[in-house]
């Protein structure tokens, strides 16, 4: 049977890395769906056996670790009672290049690099992208500039998956990397993410990325209704800031993991001349009393803006 093609993700990453990809297509994946991963052109699904190097773990496909032979196109097929959708991932696995001799001390010389920006004269933070299923335990984050490990001090302070950089100067740009230990079923793996950091003078009164909506505003919404709110973000092309919705300092998808009543949507983007306009929505399938007065915050790099739902004011006219 034919499935509707939703989109294709292009992913380039180094061999030897643990690699996850989560297949989500809200609101379809909020309800009862059958979700299966395939490697094309095979008609056999990826195994659910968690002891295999490549396996499906709930909505995720997990490579522990990647090999060069894993390059190819993977399809995630989402079926519910009425529809079928497929999301493709074009995976390119590169030779490992962590600080090898040909790189002149730089870990960042390939396409599998996150671009991030630090604001000159201010404090900024770098994100270590660590999104894995619950079956994976993550710890022992280390940060590197070039190939030298960064030690916590006045300049740098690690905090969870972030590296805070104080009083950013031009020379703080360059090649960074973060590594973390991943434990899965008693086996250990090392994750390494490479980050190319640019420093930028921040325009007075304006942050990069710039959240154009929401604006720390309230929205009147009736109890029990469905609501979709877009977060609109303008960012420079070379930046790879994380964009997400949070509540109570927790990712919305994690906070409402069990009920899936509130979900973050698929991110879309439009390329402008020297910027990209991103949109990521939040969907309230059914507004409850507990949602009123609670800030739902859109985050993009160092920028954040929230909405607060308020009960509609009665119209006495």
């Amino acid at each position: 049977d034919t499935c509707e093609d939703i989109f294709m993700h292009n992913v380039i990453i180094s061999e030897g890395q643990p690699f996850p990809f989560n297949c989500t297509y809200p609101p379809e994946t909020n309800g009862a769906v059958n979700l299966t991963w395939y490697k094309t052109p095979s008609k056999s699904p990826v195994s659910n056996n968690r002891h295999l190097r490549v396996h499906q773990d709930q909505t995720w496909i997990l490579f522990l670790p990647l090999t060069l032979e894993d390059s190819g196109i993977y399809q995630c097929v989402i079926r519910n009672a009425h529809n079928c959708y497929q999301i493709a991932v074009n995976l390119t696995v590169l030779k490992n290049h962590w600080c090898d001799s040909s790189m002149e001390g730089s870990p960042v010389n390939s396409p599998d690099v996150y671009q991030q920006i630090l604001p000159i004269g201010k404090s900024g933070s770098l994100n270590c992208h660590l999104y894995f299923p619950e079956s994976c335990a993550l710890d022992s984050i280390k940060w590197y500039k070039g190939c030298e490990e960064i030690k916590a001090g006045k300049k740098y302070s690690p905090s969870g998956a972030k590296l805070l950089v104080n009083n950013v100067a031009v020379e703080d740009g360059g090649s960074y990397a973060c590594s973390a230990r991943l434990t899965h079923l008693g086996r250990h793996f090392t994750i390494r993410n490479y980050i190319a950091v640019n420093t930028k003078e921040v325009e007075y009164g304006r942050r990069i990325p710039n959240i154009t909506y929401p604006k720390n505003n309230s929205i009147e919404v009736p109890l029990g209704s469905t609501l979709i709110v877009n977060c609109n973000i303008t960012d420079t092309k070379e930046n790879t800031n994380l964009r997400c919705w949070r509540v109570n300092n927790t990712l919305v998808d994690d906070y409402y993991k069990d009920s899936k009543r509130i979900q973050e949507g698929i991110e879309t983007n439009v390329s402008l001349r020297d910027q990209i306009r991103y949109t990521v929505n939040i969907t309230f399938l059914k507004v409850k009393m507990e949602d009123y007065g609670r800030p739902f915050t859109c985050h993009a790099g160092v920028s954040a803006a929230y909405i607060i739902l308020i009960y509609p004011v009665p119209d006495f006219r």
């Epitope: 619950e134 335990a137 710890d139 690690p158 590594s179 230990r181 250990h188 109570n248 994690d254 993991k257």
Partner: antibody, heavy 120, light 111 residues
Framework: EVQLQQSGPELVKPGASVKMSCKAS????????MHWVKQSHGKSLEWIGF????????RYNQKFKGKATLTVNKSSSTAYMDLRSLTSEDSAVYYC?????????????WGQGTTLTVSS | DIVLTQSPASLAVSLGQRATISCKAS??????????MNWYQQKPGQPPKLLIY???NLESGIPARFSGSGSGTDFTLNIHPVEEEDAATYSC?????????FGGGAKLEIK
């Protein structure tokens, strides 16, 4: 100042259940896993498991699966441990302790402990 | 599960002298250049207190007379010079894999 404030001592009968709490303050609750550790009288420490308040994930020591259930209430920054089908073997001091998600793999702050006595 | 064996189970050390406590793991707790071994101090009626993490790193606020060393399966906690307030039970703990396990403890008495 970081504090983990645990609920008071419990005296329960065999076969009963108990729910103890650990209220966190002085830090961002969702940045740390909350672990639970058992210490029987005169014995060494035993790790029970942890709850990740950031993503709702739990991990248990196989020995305590079916015995302990870990939960949290994020809005009150409180972690809970339910112990069921209690026997005299469960009499012990139970500690909650935190570990920074992603970054560390050690327990830097501990609660004062909740003493559980199971006796008929 | 990784078993941690501490020795001696108890020791008495004179004020100002060195106390040495050993912890042996049933398998290596090293990964990627790091040792996943921590040390705690516990006094009667109190919770454990972190002293040393990752085998040799001194926790903030802990006096420099405490030091940790070792790798693989063999680890040591040293206290020098021993002070009156150091009378306590000292436990090692591995965070290499779950279930995280603790040693049986070593009780330090000051002579």
């Amino acid at each position: 100042e970081v504090q983990l404030q645990q609920s008071g001592p419990e005296l329960v009968k065999p076969g009963a259940s108990v729910k103890m709490s650990c209220k966190a303050s002085g830090y961002t609750f969702t940045d740390y896993n909350m672990h639970w550790v058992k210490q029987s009288h005169g014995k060494s420490l035993e790790w029970i498991g942890f709850f990740n308040p950031n993503n709702g994930g739990t991990r248990y020591n196989q020995k305590f699966k079916g015995k302990a259930t870990l939960t949290v209430n994020k809005s009150s920054s409180t972690a809970y441990m339910d112990l069921r089908s209690l026997t005299s073997e469960d009499s012990a001091v139970y500690y909650c302790t935190r570990q920074e998600i992603y970054y560390s793999n050690y327990f830097d702050y501990w609660g004062q402990g909740t003493t559980l006595t199971v006796s008929s | 599960d990784i078993v941690l064996t501490q020795s001696p189970a108890s020791l008495a050390v004179s004020l100002g002298q060195r106390a040495t406590i050993s912890c042996k793991a049933s398998q290596s707790v090293d990964y990627d250049g790091d040792s996943y071994m921590n040390w705690y101090q516990q006094k009667p009626g109190q919770p454990p207190k972190l002293l040393i993490y990752a085998a040799s790193n001194l926790e903030s606020g802990i006096p420099a007379r405490f030091s940790g060393s070792g790798s693989g399966t063999d680890f040591t906690l040293n206290i020098h010079p021993v002070e009156e307030e150091d009378a306590a039970t000292y436990s090692c703990q591995q965070s290499y894999e779950d279930p995280y396990t603790f040693g049986g403890g070593a009780k330090l008495e000051i002579k």
